[in-house]
Amino acid sequence: MRRGPRSLRGRDAPAPTPCVPAECFDLLVRHCVACGLLRAPRPKPAGASSPAPRTALQPQE
């Protein structure tokens, strides 16, 4: 089996189920999908008026 547990069909889905490590649960499609890793927010430079935008690592294809 390549994938982790699945959710049920239908729009009234149960809570997210565990996925295999390279995946995460997409609430929109109620399914485990390939996921990249979020980077931690970059530290705000001293005196900056707004925080630097957050970014992410691309999913491995």
Epitope: C24, L28, V29, A34, L37, P59
Partner: antibody
Framework: EVQLVESGGGLVQPGGSLRLSCAAS????????IHWVRQAPGKGLEWVAW????????DYADSVKGRFTISADTSKNTAYLQMNSLRAEDTAVYYC??????????????????WGQGTLVTVSS | DIQMTQSPSSLSASVGDRVTITCRAS??????VAWYQQKPGKAPKLLIY???FLYSGVPSRFSGSGSGTDFTLTISSLQPEDFATYYC?????????FGQGTKVEIK
């Protein structure tokens, strides 16, 4: 390079059918969800349908339910939108898009990151 | 279905201006909001996902904030290439729904 290429649009009479294709390259569609989004001339974006190609789960906008069918062939890395009983209000540019996900505490944080160039569907007599 | 209401529907601004576009969801969508930029005749481009995360390759003058029902896209210093239409989209619950769009025009 990730790419999505739509084809199959054209002019069709009301009540007719069309099949749109979305050929993916640079990634495997079974790893993501694939969505169709349309845009009527001069209007905003409207989501149409999604599929998770790894298991064939689908969902549809109420406006197309029962008339449109989304499918995917993972061996061809291609998604499809079969459009039946077409109406004038279905006239739009149809885009396919990949939904990308990033892991936020086990849950997807994401959006539609790659889109095709769009294919125009015109329903008119 | 969740309605996404954008404001304003259009705005005129000059290069260098700070521009703010807001989006209100009809119910709580947590942080499951993305923002897209679209130019005439082109496909939309992802700018921001999960309300505040900048998508890869997007200039840092774009930023997003908000959670629950109220969300904001800010362009800190408008550039000539930023004149376009911007859409918010919620992806918390199917069907994913878009705002009606905000057209940013040259003053």
């Amino acid at each position: 390079e990730v790419q999505l290429v739509e084809s199959g649009g054209g002019l069709v009479q009301p009540g007719g059918s069309l099949r749109l294709s979305c050929a993916a390259s640079g990634f495997t569609i079974s790893s993501n969800s694939i969505h169709w989004v349309r845009q009527a001339p001069g209007k905003g974006l409207e989501w149409v349908a999604w599929i998770t190609p790894s298991d064939g789960n689908t969902d549809y906008a109420d406006s197309v339910k029962g008339r449109f069918t989304i499918s995917a062939d993972t061996s061809k890395n291609t998604a499809y939108l079969q459009m039946n009983s077409l109406r004038a209000e279905d006239t739009a540019v149809y885009y396919c898009a990949r939904r990308v996900c990033y892991n936020r505490l086990g849950v997807c944080a994401g959006g539609m990151d790659y889109w095709g160039q769009g294919t125009l569907v015109t329903v008119s007599s | 279905d969740i309605q996404m209401t954008q404001s304003p529907s259009s705005l005129s601004a000059s290069v260098g201006d700070r521009v703010t576009i807001t989006c209100r969801a009809s119910q709580d969508v947590s942080t499951a909001v993305a923002w897209y930029q679209q130019k005439p005749g082109k496909a939309p481009k992802l700018l921001i996902y999960s309300a505040s995360f900048l998508y890869s390759g997007v200039p840092s003058r774009f930023s997003g904030s908000g959670s629950g029902t109220d969300f904001t896209l800010t362009i800190s210093s408008l550039q000539p290439e930023d004149f376009a239409t911007y859409y918010c989209q919620q992806s918390r619950i199917t069907p994913p729904t878009f705002g009606q769009g905000t057209k940013v025009e040259i003053k």
